[in-house]
Structure formats: structure tokens, C-alpha cells
Interface confidence: low
Amino acid sequence: ASVGLPSVSLDLPRLSIQKDILTIKANTTLQITCRGQRDLDWLWPNNQSGSEQRVEVTECSDGLFCKTLTIPKVIGNDTGAYKCFYRETDLASVIYVYVQDYRSPFIASVSDQHGVVYITENKNKTVVIPCLGSISNLNVSLCARYPEKRFVPDGNRISWDSKKGFTIPSYMISYAGMVFCEAKINDESYQSIMYIVVVVGYRIYDVVLSPSHGIELSVGEKLVLNCTARTELNVGIDFNWEYPSSKHQHKKLVNRDLKTQSGSEMKKFLSTLTIDGVTRSDQGLYTCAASSGLMTKKNSTFVRVHEKPFVAFGSGMESLVEATVGERVRIPAKYLGYPPPEIKWYKNGIPLESNHTIKAGHVLTIMEVSERDTGNYTVILTNPISKEKQSHVVSLVVYVPPQIGEKSLISPVDSYQYGTTQTLTCTVYAIPPPHHIHWYWQLEEECANEPSQAVSVTNPYPCEEWRSVEDFQGGNKIEVNKNQFALIEGKNKTVSTLVIQAANVSALYKCEAVNKVGRGERVISFHVTRGPEITLQPDMQPTEQESVSLWCTADRSTFENLTWYKLGPQPLPIHVGELPTPVCKNLDTLWKLNATMFSNSTNDILIMELKNASLQDQGDYVCLAQDRKTKKRHCVVRQLTVLERVAPTITGNLENQTTSIGESIEVSCTASGNPPPQIMWFKDNETLVEDSGIVLKDGNRNLTIRRVRKEDEGLYTCQACSVLGCAKVEAFFIIEGAQEKTNLE
């Protein structure tokens, strides 16, 4: 009989006995010669390694590639397959030899003590008891005990085969503790060795791989995969692995049972696959299959093997993130990399640390984003092995719904002199800038704050008949100026102005600003009076420690009893859009002030002087005058703002720079402070003087050095000073290149 596929050039080895089956008697000599076309080897039963003393394999004397196998005095146990094969190939010729030994018809096992057969209680499963025969045509039955039962071949599911053993449905002998085969020869009974029957379970609950997913390694690293099978009791498990590079030299497989708690209804088995130094060919799907004979469960995971440690940003990494003030912002660091990189976040170059407002990790999370969070966030990925870094900048733009600056000044009804031209402003801060600012108005009398129409939190506007400013029928003649843009307190703001040509009617005006993320509004009470008039001397906002006078001028023939008051601490909460009670009707909230009276030919002038104004002097000042005829009181309110003294600060930095000879340098130094600071420039600590090449503009804010020369190199300092001190910034300007020699004729 031949085994294996014939190759192109080799014939099968040829045996001297040209039979598939040979039957010989015990105690005779077995001799078979094998001839071929290259180096040959023999394999024989029981001892497959060739070290048995009784077996002799010799080279033939009459030719190359020829070997003779000789066994003198054969015994029943020599029964089996004898194979002659070419080394390192599958090409082989086989003969099955029966050594008839009627005193020992069963081939004894190596242990010669007892065997074990494993069975499952399954109707469809058969079990083979391996009692092989040295005689092919024996009458064999199977004895099971206890209680004793005998099973004879029935030509169907119970059978005996000399090369295989006794086959029987496993459930038939599952009750038994042991079984053996029995042969009758000439009324003589011969028994095989005993086989202990072990009933095993088969149910596998699950197979789990660890790590279960996302396994990444780089070439040369060790891969360790654990496969755990959980089964019912009495289960034996066979593990089988499938993986990309199955011919791996550095592969190691270790299988073991895991201890489970006593009383547990479950067993655990573990198979560990280890590859000491992975290569790219080890990348792929790894499948662990656990089999109990009747049941197989498997699990798979993908192992990615990188050429070397690396890190790169994923294609989904954002470059621009937009958010609205107050929102939670999440910026994930999307990367491709092995091993996972260390992630560090920076804002405008400064490392970010996690706290209660910000979490800087795999995802940068800002709990409640504010405007100051706007900026460039750099995420730096560092490969922990190669230390290679990759950086990516994400610009965070925080949108701000429109905020109207004047709205924060809680002031009562300002009074405006009849017939005067007045300008109302709404200074809007919004990001992005508002796409429109609209003005609306309504008559004050339509919105009278009568007791019957008490303003409440639930009804902040007792009137809502707002009209467009284009329709000024019955009101003041209005003109809306084109929006202006101004840098106020370091912020770009939009200023919308409404010009009332002649203040004839008391009214309410509302500005409404809208941008992509929201809206804001401000209601201005425009109360027109023919009464006194307040002016400020000097006519500007005072700064702390400066002096200011408030002048109240009234026509002497119409008014008398001029008195200055200051509105006390806010008497009632002012709700959004609420109109305060007219001050003349509520003198309880006013504090009387000392003032000096002057008169000219037509007017009385009551002057209230504030020397060394302080922040406490801010507030609403009321001038009260009484009509000589009707005795009706007229009030005028003026809000006074005192600017805080602020030491000079310089916004932004001067950058060190390198410039070539002949080029120009332009730098800016923006300073703020109150009083406004004076700006001076120094080079190498010497005052910088303007000349043809050095130009200072905009109150020394901008410095230009034209056609730079080598001697312009040095340390430049911008210094901003006021009575409150100085601030300075420095930068070093390097001038490159050789100085051209100038020939003056």
C-alpha cells in the first residue's frame, strides 16, 4: 500500500513483500526489504522511533537506497503497520502484519496494566475500545461491569476491527466502571487488558481571548495571547490555534487547567500562545478553538504588527472647533500609533493641567467654555518608545452671544433737555460680531409706570408695542448712524448710534443685536424735560483722585429751590427691561448733598464739587428744581462714572527678530492704563531718538527702522510710564549680512 502523493521525480519505495496485509505465525522471523531512489527509513508498531532492541534495520549489500527490516521470533504485539518512507517526505509504502498468537490474540498496550476510555452520554456518539487483534478474524465481544453485561457485534453500530478495536455507542457502557474485550478460540477465552470508563462532559460555556481586541505590537516584541475556556464538569478540552505565520520558530503553546472554587459547577482551561519576537508576517487574525469532542467554540482577535513604533494624527483630527460660551467642549486627540502615545495639551504654548474646569487627556474637555478659552491648542503626541513627537494645532473659537456694554450700568431714567439733539449708543460685544443691530421705540406714556400697571418679574414689560425707528410718527425724529467698530478694553466692539434730532417726546428706545449664537437687547428710557440741565466740568469722565464739578443750571424765572441729591443704594431690584420709579416721586431714596449756588443774568447754577474723586463717588446724581408757579418738582439725573487708576500694562510681546541689512523693521507696542501712559523707546538702554531712519508714530506706539544697518542691532525696549509706574517689554534685533561700504564723492 502506498501513502502520500507521488512527486514528479520519485517513485514510491518498493517492498519485498508486495501485499497490503501479511499474516505470519508467532515465533517466526519477519523480514521485509525496501528499495527506493533516495535515503529510506522504517517505522513499525509500538516503537515508532527505531530504538527497539529486537528490531534490526540493515543496509542491503546489493545496492544503494535499500534497507531490510528484520524481527526474529515475532510476537502478537508486533502486529501492526510497517512503513518504509523517504526521509523528509510523505512518500511511503505500508504493509500491515498480523502475528498470529493464539495464546495472546489481543495486542497488549505499552503500559500492559489498564487503559482508559473517555465517553460522553450522547445517543449519537460511539466510542472505540482499542483492543486490537493479532489475528484479523476473531470472534470478539465486549464485557462491561458492574453489573456485568456482554455486547456482541451486531453488524450495525456494534463492531470489532482488528486494526481499530471494539466500537459501541457510548451511552451503552456509560453505566460501567470498566470494560474489556474477550475472544473465544477453540472454546478457550482470551481477555484484553481492562479499560476504565471515564464519563466526560462536553458542554463549553464560552471561549474568551485576552487581550480581546486592539492588540498592537511592533516588530520584535513579544505577543502573549490567553485563551480561556469555561466548561461544565468532567470535560476535557483540546485547544487549537490558527494564526497567520504557523511555521513560527519562536512560538510557544502552554495549556493548563485553572483552579476553580470548590463546589463550582464549572471548569476553566487556559491555553497561552506566546511568540517571542513578532514579525510583520505575524500580523493577522488569531483564532483559538476549544473542543471537547462533541462541541467546539472559538474566538478570534486581530493582531496588528507595526514595522516600528510610530505615531501620527488620524485623518479625522479637527483643526477648528467652534463653541458657544457656557458649552462643554470636547476635542479628542485622534491618532494612529503604536504604542499608544503620551498625550500633552498646550494652550498658546503653555502646558495644560487638569482641574475642575478642564480635563486634559485623551480628550481635551472644557467643562464650561468661556471666552478666555479661545486660542490655539497644541496637542503633542509622544511615542513612548521612539520618543518621536507629532504636533497638531486646534483652533478653538468661542462664540459669544451679543452683550451690550451699557446694559450693565444700572441707572435710573436719565433726563434729556427738551429740543436738544441726543445720541443713544449700544456698544455690542459679540463673537462673531453681530450681523445686525436694530433699533425700536415706543412712547413713554404708552408705557406709563402707573400703580395699576405695576412692573413685576413675571411681567417686566407692561408694554410691548415696539415700533421700528423708520416709523417715528408721533415720536422724535431719528437717524441711525452706520455701525462703528472700536477697540474698547482690548475687545473689538460694534457701536451702534441712534441720533435723536430734537428731543420733543419722552420715549423708550430698544437696541437689539443678533449674531449666529444668540441675541442681546438694551432698553433706554429717554425722558424729555424742560427743566434744569446738568453739565459736567471738565466735560469728561474723571479718573480717581481728579476733581470734577457737577453743574445744575435752571432758568431763574421758571424754577426755584435747586437741590443736589445722590441716588442711594439701589432701593428696588431692577429687573430686565424694568423701568425704575421716577426719582421725583420717591425722594426717600435720595441723599441731599452740599452745593454752592451761583447766578448770572438769567440762570441759577448749583455747583456740586467732588475733590479727589473716588470710585465711591460713582453713581446717579439728581438735580431737583421746583416750578415757581405750579410747585411741581422737576428732576434731572446724571450718571457719573469715575475711572479707576490703572498702572501701565503692555499688551503683547515684542518678538526677537533677525533682519537683513537694508530691510525695514516695524514693531508695535500697545500700552494701556489710566491715566494713559507715555511710551518711550530705548536701544541698549539709551533713549531712542528719531532721525531719518527711525520713525515713531501714533504716540510712539509704532517704531519703524528703515534700511537697517549693522549698528541698529541691539536690545530694544518699549517702556510705558504714568504716575502709577512703568511697564516695559524687550526684544533683541539681530542684523544679518555685511555692511556695504558707501563711497561719498
Epitope: 510610530f310 505615531v311 501620527a312 494624527f313 485623518s315 483630527m317 483643526s319 518621536e388 507629532q390 504636533s391
Partner: antibody, heavy 121, light 110 residues
Framework: EVQLLESGGGWVKPGGSLRLSCAAS????????MTWVRQAPGKGLEWVSY????????YSADSVRGRFTISRDNAKNSVYLQMNSLRAEDTAVYYC??????????????WGRGTMVTVSS | LPVLTQPPSVSAAPGQKVTIPCSGT????????VSWYQQLPGTAPKLLIY???KRPSGIPDRFSGSKSGTSATLGITGLQTGDEADYYC???????????FGEGTKLTVL
Amino acid sequence: EVQLLESGGGWVKPGGSLRLSCAASGFPFSDYYMTWVRQAPGKGLEWVSYITTGGRIIYSADSVRGRFTISRDNAKNSVYLQMNSLRAEDTAVYYCARPLRELSPGGFDLWGRGTMVTVSS
Amino acid sequence: LPVLTQPPSVSAAPGQKVTIPCSGTYSNIVNNYVSWYQQLPGTAPKLLIYDNNKRPSGIPDRFSGSKSGTSATLGITGLQTGDEADYYCGTWDNSLRRWVFGEGTKLTVL
């Protein structure tokens, strides 16, 4: 003007070497990964190699790995392809390409005109 | 074997609509942005679509891109004779860790 200009192509015998250059202008070169793509006569586009902004990471197609080396000089706004052990199958038009986004490996919105490399004996 | 599969050729009459499919796998099309390129005879490729469905400025809205699962599609409406060209899809492949192009599709305007 934003552009890429390749040079250095020509005829070479199998086993020989060539160095291709790509000069970039009109954009912040050091902010972009740079890529070489080739196209054999009558065939489709084949990605050859790319290099990250600082030149620390390079990836190459299996067909050229070990023979071709990509490098860059950010000061000169240039990217190079050193081609050694050239084979007949390396005959192609070689394009230099820039990805659409900074710090991104692909999606090429800027291409050079290409330079022809012919490998034959 | 090509990583991204495209039909070798497609054809349609002027004014008609044509679609060019590009088939890939989980590691490329599913996980990454797809871009499309047009290569007119004798010229360098030109970016038509990026990020699956976005058009660079200057690309008419007759060209559109879409992606679903492991497939991406380039659509061209109102075909013109000037659209006769080779069209390539491209994307990053996470497993191969390299950029991959489709084999290319020749568009003929009948």
C-alpha cells in the same frame, strides 16, 4: 503662486540610481506632509512614499522599500526621492504631491507636473 | 490584488449622469476619508472631491461624492465631452499604513 516643481528625471540603466527633487513655493512647506506618487506608462496611480513635516517618519510602498528614500529640507522648501537599484518596472512619471490639510497624510490638492524616469538597458 | 476596486471603464452620453463606484474594506474606506481625482490625458491628477463629499473651490457642483460602508461613489451629472478622463479614488489604509489608489476608471462621453 502655490506650486510644486519636480526635476531630476531621465534615462538610467537597471541597477542605477537617480535623485528626484521637488521644489515647493507659495505655501508654508514645513506644515505639510509631502508625498511622491508615480504612474507607469498606460497604468494607474501608485503611491510611492511620504514624509512627515519634520522628516522623522517616512512610509514607503512595499515595491520600493529598501531601494527608495524620501527626504526633505524645510529650509529649502524641497522634498527629494533618492532611487537606488532601479528596475525596469520603476519606469514611470513621478509626481510630487501635497495633501489638502496640514499634518495629514493624504487627499492631495496640489500636484507637480511630473518628471519621467526611464529604466532600460 | 488591488486594494480599492474600480470598474475599468464607464460611458454615457453628453448631458447624462454617471456614477463610478470604488470598493474597499473596513481598514480603508470605512475608517477614513475618501478623495477622488480626475486625470485628463497627458496631465497631472487633479483633486475633485475630498473628505468623502466636499468639493475644492473651482470644482463645479456637477461632481459629487458619497460614502456608505466599504464603498465610495463619484457622481457626475450633466456630462460634458471635457469630462473624458481617468478617475481615481484614494484613501488611507489603516492596516497597510499607506495611501492607496483605486485602479482607475476611464470615462468615455459617447
